[in-house]
């Protein structure tokens, strides 16, 4: 919306937000740090949802894909005041609530979840925000965490996928705008296309599914694609080889003309899935074509 | 199919103890947090206690704590409820119900513990 | 924490809509469950996070949750609709499940 890069990808984001006292003169630059990378992700298959934490978490905007409802949400946090203690886990559990919510429906999407704090978390709050961390992971969440200012990195590294799902921000509020591109570039999984997009019906063939972030897995072996075959049945498959920005994968044999298959990716063995536009269709192929 | 039944109710004393079970079958007992649920006579539901998938962690209702402890056998596929130092009020049907983040998407038929002199 | 207000009884003719209504100080910014139960029986979910239906519950079971209030509308109401319902929301795991005082659902 605002031009430079964009993610495309289709996943559910939950941005949890420390909203303790010692967050009180800095809420500005936390909201325009959300804002400006809420307008990134541009798919129509991404939904949203905004949670803050101090002495209890707060679901300010449950999870929707609605433009509009993703903009009164913005305004709702803008008007948030900081003030309690920092009680991580608790955001962390209010997002993996509606994962657990959302999972009951069948389809599993993906879910990505940035957490932002200023602090150290003493020795009860951190164990507590590892093991609800934990929690959403075991729920198929990719877990980011956003370091400000007072943070102990060792701390986020373990609340976090690894240290490589870090963000510090050494140099205080003010410089939360300076790792947008990162986050973003590190945080987003897309699916942007497959090649080829058109296939022989009753053939095997190879698909090139191109896209960014594929790498991110925790776990590089637990990447699928997936192809949801006429909106109704799922095939996965193991890709044979994952780069950052191209997966490699055995196609499903499509045996009639015309049938569709909506590619996805799973970053943790089919639990949850990331969706795309893209599509890849069957057509009659005469011998030697 | 998913069920859970629970037994161990009854009449009991004022100050005295009992000890409830909740047998579960049809699903992965240790994939899910439980829960102990209940009502009194012509009243509504109250929440007394919650247990994690692995029983690590333990949550009470202010009424309960420090009186009843939630535990579960996960080699057995049981729930249980012991309750401790028990009140008049502690009369009800006491439901175990398979949870999620507040969520009770299984119930059993539920057991009646009537303390009374 | 969060305390959830239910009206003791609603009346309703039936093949008409029904609303028994869940309030609670902004409500919106929790998810809302709803249980119907009927007399002798264990509770049995209808909907939860605010307007999912389980499977096996009938298509006339909804939900909404606006403001300080959720709302389960049964449209088309049935005689077998007649029950007691209980809205409840989950404030964490330190306060654990809040029900509502629970709704007799009369089916005139």
């Known amino acids: 919306e605002d031009g430079g890069p964009a993610c495309y990808g289709g996943f559910d984001l939950y941005f949890i937000l420390d909203k303790s006292g010692s967050v009180l003169h800095h809420w500005n630059e936390i909201y325009y740090f959300v804002e400006q990378l809420a307008h990134k992700f541009i798919s129509p298959q991404l939904r949203m949802s905004f949670i803050v934490f101090s002495t209890r978490g707060t679901t300010l905007m449950k999870l929707t894909e609605d433009r509009e409802q993703i903009r009164q949400g913005l305004e709702e946090l803008q008007k948030v005041l900081p003030g309690g203690d920092t009680y991580m886990h608790e955001g962390f559990e209010r997002a993996s609530e509606q994962i657990y919510y959302e999972n009951r429906q069948g389809y599993r999407t993906a879910s990505v979840i940035i957490a932002l704090t200023d602090g150290e978390l003493h020795e009860d709050l951190f164990f507590y925000s590892e093991r609800e961390a934990n929690r959403s992971r075991d729920l198929g969440a990719i877990v980011y965490c956003v370091g400000v200012k007072d943070f102990n990195e060792t701390q986020l590294a373990r609340i976090a996928d690894s240290k490589d799902h870090v963000f510090p921000v050494n140099d205080g509020f003010q410089a939360l705008q300076g790792i947008i591109h990162s986050i973003l570039k590190k945080s987003c999984i897309e699916i942007l296309a497959a090649e080829p997009s058109t296939i022989c019906a009753g053939e095997s063939f190879q698909v090139v599914v191109r896209g960014n972030g594929f790498r991110h897995a925790r776990n590089v072996d637990r990447v699928l694609c997936s192809f949801k075959i006429n909106d109704s049945v799922t095939l996965n498959e193991k890709p044979f080889s994952v780069e950052d920005t191209y997966l490699l994968c055995p196609a499903p044999i499509l045996k009639e003309v015309g049938m569709k298959a909506a590619l996805q990716v799973s970053m943790n063995d089919g639990l949850s899935f990331i969706s795309s536009s893209v599509i890849i269709t069957t057509t009659h192929c005469s011998d030697g074509s | 199919q998913v069920q859970l039944v629970e037994s161990g109710g009854g009449l009991v004393q004022p100050g005295g103890s009992l000890r409830l079970s909740c047998a579960a079958s049809?699903?992965?007992?240790?994939?899910?947090?439980l829960s102990w649920v209940r009502q009194a006579p012509g009243k509504g539901l109250e929440w007394v206690s919650n247990i994690s998938s692995n029983g690590s962690y333990t949550y009470y209702a202010d009424s309960v704590k420090g009186r009843f402890t939630i535990s579960r056998d996960n080699s057995k596929n049981t729930l249980y409820l012991q309750m401790n130092s028990l009140r008049a009020e502690d009369t009800a049907v006491y439901y175990c119900a398979r949870a999620g983040y507040g969520l009770f998407d299984v119930w059993g038929q539920g057991t009646l513990v009537t303390v009374s002199s | 924490d969060i305390e959830l207000t239910q009206p003791p009884s609603v009346s309703v003719a039936p093949g008409q809509t029904a609303r028994i209504s869940c309030s609670g100080d902004k409500l919106r910014e929790y998810y809302v469950h709803w249980y119907q139960q009927k007399p002798g029986q264990a509770p049995v979910l209808v909907i939860y996070?605010?307007?999912k239906r389980p499977s096996g519950i009938p298509e006339r079971f909804s939900g909404s949750n606006s403001g300080n209030t959720a709302t389960l509308t049964i449209s088309g109401t049935q005689a077998e609709d007649e029950a007691d319902y209980y809205c409840s929301s989950w404030a964490g795991s330190r306060s654990g499940t809040v029900f509502g005082g629970g709704t007799k659902l009369t089916v005139l």
């Open positions: 996070g605010d307007n």
């Open positions: 049809g699903f992965t007992f240790n994939s899910y947090g």
